[in-house]
Interface confidence: medium
C-alpha cells in the first residue's frame, strides 16, 4: 500500500546512553522525507524531526520528562517536495518502533574514576557521578540522582605486579578498600543496575593506577 514513490521506514532502533536517546531507522531516503512522532502509552502523539532526510531523530527532550514511562515512536514517510501526498489509505506510510522504557533500558555510560586517596592501608576510590540529560530545576541530574539506590558500582582492583583481581561493591559513589602497604594497585569500575533484565552493566571505566597523577596519597 502507499504511494509508489515512498517506502516505509524499517529497522527502527532505540540508541540510548545515560538517557541521551536517539531513534534510528532505515533506509536512507531517496526522493522521500521522514517525520517522527513519539507518545507514551496513554498520551498524545508529538511530532519531531519534521520532514527530515536524516535517518535518526534525537528524542531526548521528550523521554527525559518522565524516564519511567514507556514510549512508542513511529516514523512517517512522505514524498520529497510533496509532503501532503498520502498513501492509498489516506494516510502517509509509517512504521512503529519497539516500546522503550528509558529507566529500564538506557545504556549506562562508561564510568570514570574521579580520584583515589590512600591513607595507610586503606584506599578511598571515588567514582565520578556522571551527568545525564535529565534536567530538573535548571540543572542536569546525575546518574545517582536518577537511579538512586538502584545503581551500584563494582570496583575491580589488583596489584600492579600481579593479575589477580579482587572486587568490591558499593551503592554510593565511594569505595573504601584494604590494600597492602607499599604496594601499588590498579582500579577499574563498572556501573550496574542489578534489578534490570537488560543493559544491566556499563562498560568498564579506564584503568587508573596508583603512582600516577590521578590519585592523592597521604601516608600516615
Amino acid at each position: 500500500s502507499g504511494t509508489t514513490n515512498t517506502v516505509a521506514a524499517y529497522n527502527l532502533t532505540w540508541k540510548s546512553t545515560n538517557f541521551k536517546t536517539i531513534l534510528e531507522w532505515e533506509p536512507k531516503p531517496v526522493n522521500q522525507v521522514y517525520t517522527v512522532q513519539i507518545s507514551t502509552k496513554s498520551g498524545d502523539w508529538k511530532s519531531k524531526c519534521f520532514y527530515t532526510t536524516d535517518t535518526e531523530c534525537d528524542l531526548t527532550d521528550e523521554i527525559v520528562k518522565d524516564v519511567k514511562q514507556t514510549y512508542l515512536a513511529r516514523v512517517f514517510s512522505y514524498p520529497a517536495g510533496n509532503v501532503e501526498s498520502t498513501g492509498s489509505a489516506g494516510e502517509p506510510l509509517y512504521e512503529n518502533s519497539p516500546e522503550f522504557t528509558p529507566y529500564l533500558e538506557t545504556n549506562l555510560g562508561q564510568p570514570t574514576i574521579q580520584s583515589f586517596e590512600q591513607v595507610g592501608t586503606k584506599v578511598n576510590v571515588t567514582v565520578e557521578d556522571e551527568r545525564t540529560l535529565v534536567r530538573r530545576n535548571n540543572t542536569f541530574l546525575s546518574l545517582r540522582d536518577v537511579f538512586g539506590k538502584d545503581l551500584i558500582y563494582t570496583l575491580y582492583y589488583w596489584k600492579s605486579s600481579s593479575s589477580g583481581k579482587k572486587t568490591a561493591k558499593t551503592n554510593t559513589n565511594e569505595f573504601l578498600i584494604d590494600v597492602d602497604k607499599g604496594e601499588n594497585y590498579c582500579f577499574s569500575v563498572q556501573a550496574v543496575i542489578p534489578s534490570r533484565t537488560v543493559n544491566r552493566k556499563s562498560t568498564d571505566s579506564p584503568v587508573e593506577c596508583m603512582g600516577q597523577e590521578k590519585g592523592e596519597f597521604r601516608e600516615i
Epitope: 557521578d129 530545576n137 540522582d145
Partner: antibody, heavy 121, light 106 residues
Framework: EVQLVESGGGLVQPGGSLRLSCAAS????????MSWVRQAPGKGLEWVGF??????????EYAASVKGRFTISRDNSKNSLYLQMNTLRTEDTAVYYC????????????WGQGTLVTVSS | AIQMTQSPSSLSASVGERVTITCRAS??????LNWYQHKPGKGPKLLIY???TLQTGVPSRFSGSGSGTDFTFTVSNLQPEDIATYYC????????FGQGTKLEIK
Amino acid sequence: EVQLVESGGGLVQPGGSLRLSCAASGFTFTEYHMSWVRQAPGKGLEWVGFIRNRAQGYTTEYAASVKGRFTISRDNSKNSLYLQMNTLRTEDTAVYYCARLTMVVAEFDYWGQGTLVTVSS
Amino acid sequence: AIQMTQSPSSLSASVGERVTITCRASQDINKYLNWYQHKPGKGPKLLIYYTSTLQTGVPSRFSGSGSGTDFTFTVSNLQPEDIATYYCLQYDNLLTFGQGTKLEIK
C-alpha cells in the same frame, strides 16, 4: 535507617535572626539534595528552598518569599543541613521541616519531625 | 514565581465515592506536577508524579490528569484511610505547593 532531626527553633522578635539545624543519618549525605519546607499554623505546606548535592556543586534555590533573607548551607563533614533566617517577619512563624529531596520526580522522600519558629514581639 | 491554586480547600465524601481535586498553575508547567498526601504527625507522601504516574506501592484508586495549567487528582473509591490533606506541587520551575485540600469522610 534514614533519620532527619531538626533543632534550633524558638521565639524571636520581628527583625531578628535564627539558625536552624538538621542532623542527617542513615544515608550518604553528599549524594542527596536537601530542602526546607515550612507549615504556618493552620496553613498548608510551603517550600522554602533547597541545596543541591555534590554532583550539582551544592548550589541553592529559594522561594521568592524568603530570597535574600534566608540562607541554606550544609556541613558535609557533620552530615548537617542549616537554615540561617535573617530579618524575620511575623509571617515566617511556622513549623520548619528539613526533607531529603529526590529531584528527578521532586519527591521529598524523608522528613524530619519539624521545629517551631515563632516570630512575635 | 509560579503560583498554584488548589480547590476546594476542604471536602467531605462517603466511603466508596469518587472525589476530585483540581490545581491550576499561573503559567504553563508542562506536566511537572505531583500530588502528595499528608496525614497528621507524618511526613507528606508522594502519590503521583509527572501529572499521572503512580508512585510505586500507591493504590490504583488514585489517579491524576492534565497538562499545561489545569490538573486534576481523583480518588475513585474513597477509603477510610484516605482521610488526609492533599497537596499539588509544581516542579517545572523551582517548587510550589498548592494550598492543600482537607479530605474528610462523611
